[in-house]
């Protein structure tokens, strides 16, 4: 029985035509939300003339569907038992299920006066960007809407940059009508436990953002893993927006909608600073923001954003130390809302609920030469926005599953 | 458009002092730091140093720190410029200049002469 | 300091050549370079910045090279008001420094 079982799983989530595995793989099956709190700045004066705490105030939930597009340039390599694809990105707003539209208007820092002076440290170079940005009426704040922070504006200071910049700015600039990838992943044709396992992103197998195995795609998507999941494994996984592989370890049993499944979590650990976890050493990349290494809870990720100074922690500033979270007020960080989770069903490795989770901060820090920061005493990582991205199995789906899967095995 | 207007020509007894000035005009005279530059005859340039017209903040070559002495006056768009115990050596036409996109204005510059 | 030298204090040129003025610094200043036209009795006239950027208005027959040590202010179809001094200044690091200037004669 057991092992007519593990046969029958073991041909079904391989990746290829005619497998179950393969049509929800090509195009998921599961409605996916992606909801973004805006931090909503309260004090932009004080904050600019005095270097006072930020004060914010989350506004949302904003919520688009994501992840509806089915899977672009699927090409099987039967060479090496890969298959290769695209993920295209859309969103769609999504009204009903949003505090408002995606005109509200919110105080953020402004990204492109923080990247600016980030990017272009030379002294002589700022006092030309302190110009630009009087000129253009910028300041350290700016008010934007929801469609212009997540999707694009052009901005005005950029604009008058003499240099061949991009003037578009935007926290998730460009989505629409892209792709992430070319992703190759093991199609588990000649070993089902590497089935859905990264084998390149981008053509590489590294991602050259890091030092040492920080660098390594490690792991799957975290849509599915390979079948068989056991309690004991650490599941790896590679997610793009974070610009890094991570992991996750088995937290309870759950039950979704009548399917036993495993919930595995993002642990503290994996966020800690190498002076509690060494393997992290290779994650902090300057001594100074991060109080030579010891910082933790925030993941610098410049490098991977064309040198702006992105930093990518969990909503809230859970898990991070208390020097990160102290100049930001109006932060209440706790496990249940804030931490990244994975419900996988074991017997398939498929993920059939998640919940991920994560906040975009950028640095901003003084600047003799640019008068909108000249007042700033210390170094601020400010919290733009954090969002939740979910998805779980229809009912349809979880009968179907029930019956096909779980109900042949009990 | 940015004009920068600088004061006369100068001559003056070596030991004493004299306070140049630059009147700015056709743009927002506290948004843009204000630069000074030296050039004696014949000879190359200088950099003196620069101040924020926001703040009064200068910074100054080593070179000219306790010679020259930035300040700036708001109310009349104009910057200054004082060079103490004058020598012959500072006999030399000095030239303000705003950062806009670099030193890209300069004024008609100041001609110092230093002389008993 | 970061010192810039001009090599060439005089070029002699006829109008329609083309013609190249050298900039060496002491040390790497990256591409943080900016020249200047000076003519007779006028004051600096700025033309290129971060080594090869022109100034708007700057006739395109005026082109930058170069970064870390070696830069090169190019005039090609030499006019007979391109008759002026030309200095090179590094902004890299401070203070800032000017090269010591070269003459352009026109034959």
């Known amino acids: 029985g057991d092992l007519l079982i593990q046969k029958t799983i073991k041909k079904q989530v391989v990746l290829e035509e005619g497998t179950i595995a393969f049509k929800n793989w090509v195009k998921t099956g599961t409605e996916v939300y992606r909801q973004f709190w805006i931090f909503d700045v309260q004090n932009p004066q004080e904050v600019m003339m005095n270097s006072s705490n930020i004060q914010v105030k989350q506004r949302g939930p904003y919520t688009y569907r994501v992840r509806f597009l089915a899977k672009e340039n699927v090409t099987q390599d039967a060479e090496d038992n890969t298959v290769s694809f695209l993920q295209p990105n859309g969103a769609i707003f999504e009204p009903s299920l949003s505090v408002g539209t995606e005109a509200d208007n919110f105080t953020v820092l402004n990204l492109a006066v923080a990247a600016a002076s980030h990017i272009y440290q030379n002294q002589f170079v700022q006092m030309i960007l302190n110009s630009l940005i009087n000129k253009s009426k910028s300041s350290m704040f700016q008010v934007r809407t929801l469609r212009e922070l997540l999707w694009g504006y052009r901005d005005p200071f950029l604009s008058l940059v003499p240099y061949p910049v991009t003037t578009t700015v935007g926290l998730f600039y460009p989505y629409n009508n892209t792709a992430d990838g070319v992703y190759k992943v093991f199609n588990g044709k000649d070993n089902i436990s590497k089935v859905a396992i990264i084998d390149t992103y981008k053509g590489k197998r590294n991602l050259s953002y890091w030092e040492s195995h920080c660098d390594m795609i490690n792991g799957t998507d975290a849509a599915s893993f390979p079948p068989f999941v056991e309690k004991s494994q650490v599941l790896q996984f590679f997610s793009s927006d974070i610009c890094r592989s991570i992991y996750a370890v088995f937290e309870s049993d759950v039950n979704l909608k009548g399917i036993p499944v495993y919930r595995f979590v993002l642990p503290s650990k994996a966020f800690a600073s190498p002076v509690e976890n060494p393997d992290n050493y290779c994650f902090c990349t300057e001594k100074i923001i991060s109080k030579n290494c010891t910082s933790y809870g925030v993941l610098d990720i410049s490098k991977c954003k064309e040198g702006r100074p992105v930093y990518i922690s969990l909503p809230h500033f859970l898990y991070a130390s208390p020097d990160v979270s102290e100049p930001i007020d109006g932060l209440n960080p706790n496990e249940e809302e804030h931490r990244t989770y994975l419900d996988i069903e074991p017997i398939t490795g498929f993920t059939l609920q998640f919940a991920k989770r994560l906040q975009v901060n950028l640095l901003v820090k003084p600047s003799e030469k640019i008068q909108v920061l000249k007042n700033l005493k210390r170094n601020y990582i400010v919290p733009i926005l954090w969002l939740n991205e979910t998805g779980t199995i229809g009912d349809e789906k979880a009968n179907m599953f029930r019956s096909q899967v779980t109900g042949k095995i009990n | 458009e940015v004009q920068l207007q600088q004061s006369g020509a100068e001559l003056v007894k070596p030991g004493a002092s004299v306070k140049l000035s630059c009147k700015a005009s056709?743009?927002?005279?506290?948004?843009?730091?204000m630069h000074w530059v030296k050039q004696r005859p014949g000879q190359g340039l200088e950099w003196i140093g620069e101040?924020?017209?926001?703040?009064?903040?200068?910074n100054y070559n080593q070179k000219f720190k306790g010679k020259a002495t930035l300040t700036v006056d708001k109310s009349s768009s104009t910057a200054y410029m004082q060079l103490s115990s004058l020598t012959s050596e500072d006999s030399a036409v000095y030239y303000c200049?705003?950062?806009?996109?670099?030193?890209?204005?300069w004024g008609q510059g100041t001609t110092l002469t230093v002389s008993s | 300091d970061i010192v810039l030298t001009q090599s060439q204090k005089f070029m002699s040129t006829s109008v329609g050549d083309r013609v190249s003025v050298t900039c060496k610094a002491s040390?790497?200043?990256?591409?943080?370079v900016a020249w200047y036209q000076q003519k007779p009795g006028q004051s600096p006239k700025a033309l290129i910045y971060?080594?090869?950027y022109r100034y708007s208005g700057v006739p395109d027959r005026f082109t930058g090279s170069g970064s870390g040590t070696d830069f090169t202010l190019t005039i090609s179809n030499v006019q007979p008001e391109d008759l002026a001094e030309y200095f090179c200044?590094?902004?890299?690091?401070?203070?800032?420094?000017f090269g010591g200037g070269t003459k352009l004669e026109i034959k």
């Open positions: 200049a705003p950062i806009y996109y670099g030193l890209d204005n």
């Open positions: 056709g743009y927002t005279f506290t948004s843009y730091w």
């Open positions: 101040i924020d017209p926001s703040d009064s903040h200068a």
């Open positions: 040390q790497n200043v990256g591409t943080n």
């Open positions: 971060s080594a090869s």
């Open positions: 200044q590094q902004y890299n690091s401070y203070p800032l420094t």
